[in-house]
Interface confidence: low
């Protein structure tokens, strides 16, 4: 004859207010004959939760049909959970006796505790933009969860980060907890399209972690590189000079041309293009009139990017006598 075992597989059951909780209990033997009852707590003060034979338990239903002859599943469901329902629940086997049944064996118990889901993580980046190769900090916060155990991870474009510090408050007992984590991220020049993700995993989320994101485009400034070149072709008595501003972010840019130190107010042609990495290129063309009186022309392309100090590149125009004498429209 197999010895009866009372199996309650969950040590801890986390439930949320208003939901239904399932308390599992199975037996390994049909003997001895007698009922299985559910209690909360132990000792003389324990509270009867369910008795199939007698009593009225409107919030409790059984998972299996207890009237079936060979039933060995005595699991129950408790609906509309409230904070008053927390405690340790025991399924207890009684041996049929006279005048009354005698307690025979108890299950190990399942502790029912209230769980609360964490709020969606909010990720905040630095207040000011920073250039590549520098480290910036991102903070992630989530609130209102219980129990206290929680896992927080940081990712950059899917790669897990290791340089972060996390605190869960309060340290003592509480009905709800908050988590705050600060991650340090080194910026790369191609991070305009990058994301940092804060991921929070909690037992109440049933395997679907919550994520908060921040775009590194809001934290990064990629300063431009400048190149000024004289085009070999000319149109009539004009020479075309190009200022190429490459690989900058954000788009905010002011470009001015100077001729021999004098700022030129006239319109210049320009184009803006976006690179695959999210940075921008800006090309500006400046037409310089060639005349006998203009032997030494120094052109300056000055760029002010995203409110930073202006940077500039100079070009001393090379105008040969041969070029001055040409009258065709397009001569090398």
């Amino acid at each position: 004859e197999e010895e009866l075992q009372m199996i309650q597989p969950e040590k801890l059951l986390l439930v949320t207010v208003g939901k239904t909780a399932t308390l599992h209990c199975t037996v390994t033997s049909l003997l001895p004959v007698g009922p299985v009852l559910w209690f909360r707590g132990v000792g003389p003060g324990r509270e009867l939760i369910y008795n199939q034979k007698e009593g009225h338990f409107p919030r409790v239903t059984t998972v299996s049909d207890l009237t079936k002859r060979n039933n060995m599943d005595f699991s129950i469901r408790i609906s509309s959970i409230t904070p008053a329902d927390v405690g340790t629940y025991y399924c207890v086997k009684f041996r049929k006796g006279s005048p009354e049944n005698v307690e025979f064996k108890s299950g190990p118990g399942t502790e029912m505790a209230l769980g609360a889901k964490p709020s969606a993580p909010v990720v905040l980046g630095p207040a000011a933009r920073t250039t590549p190769e520098h480290t910036v900090s991102f903070t992630c916060e989530s609130h209102g969860f219980s129990p206290r155990d929680i896992t927080l991870k940081w990712f950059k474009n899917g790669n897990e980060l290791s340089d972060f510090q996390t605190n869960v408050d309060p340290t003592g007992q509480s009905v709800a907890y908050s988590i705050r984590s600060t991650a340090r991220v080194v910026l790369d020049p191609w991070d305009v399209r990058s994301q940092v993700i804060c991921e929070v995993a909690h037992v109440t989320l049933q395997g679907d972690p919550l994520r908060g994101t921040a775009n590194l485009s809001e934290a990064i400034r990629v300063p431009p590189t400048l190149e000024v070149t004289q085009q070999p072709m000319r149109v009539g008595n004009q020479v075309n000079v190009t200022c190429q501003v490459r690989k900058f972010y954000p788009q905010s840019l002011q470009l001015t041309w100077s001729e021999n130190g004098n700022v030129c107010q006239r319109e210049t042609a320009s184009t803006l293009t976006e690179n695959k990495d999210g940075t921008y290129n800006w090309t500006s063309w400046f037409l310089v009139n060639i005349s006998d009186q203009r032997d030494d022309v120094v052109l300056t392309c000055q760029v002010k990017h995203d409110g930073q100090l202006a940077v500039s590149k100079r070009l001393a125009l090379e105008v040969t006598v041969h070029q001055k004498d040409q009258s065709s429209d397009a001569t090398p």
Epitope: K11, L12, T151, K153, E160, E199, V203, G207
Partner: nanobody
Framework: QVQLVESGGGLVQPGGSLRLSCADS????????TGWFRQAPGKEREGVAC????????KYTDSVKGRFTISRDNAKKTVYLQMNSLKPEDTAVYYC???????????????????WGQGTQVTVSS
Amino acid sequence: QVQLVESGGGLVQPGGSLRLSCADSEFRLDEYATGWFRQAPGKEREGVACISRSGSNTKYTDSVKGRFTISRDNAKKTVYLQMNSLKPEDTAVYYCAADLTSHYLSCSSYTDYNSWGQGTQVTVSS
């Protein structure tokens, strides 16, 4: 609900091998870090090995390194413990456990597990 079931235990001679399996039918074992623990008579339960959700991260207690291998088949929602070169001191009830709060790459510390199976007996004796 979490229903972990271990299998593969039994009686084996010293130097022999066993493969334990841990499966579940009620939830997605492939979404959690999973560990193997053991409890010998009169001793405390100790962590033996653990594996991250992805399977890329594993950890072993010193006494089993080089002899035991933990692995997982996420398609079958099963975690295995291959035990080679078994010794009498490996005799214990072996438990499988899942850490419901750990995800992705981490292999949890042995104190973090919060869902347990019923255990399977492993006896190493000649």
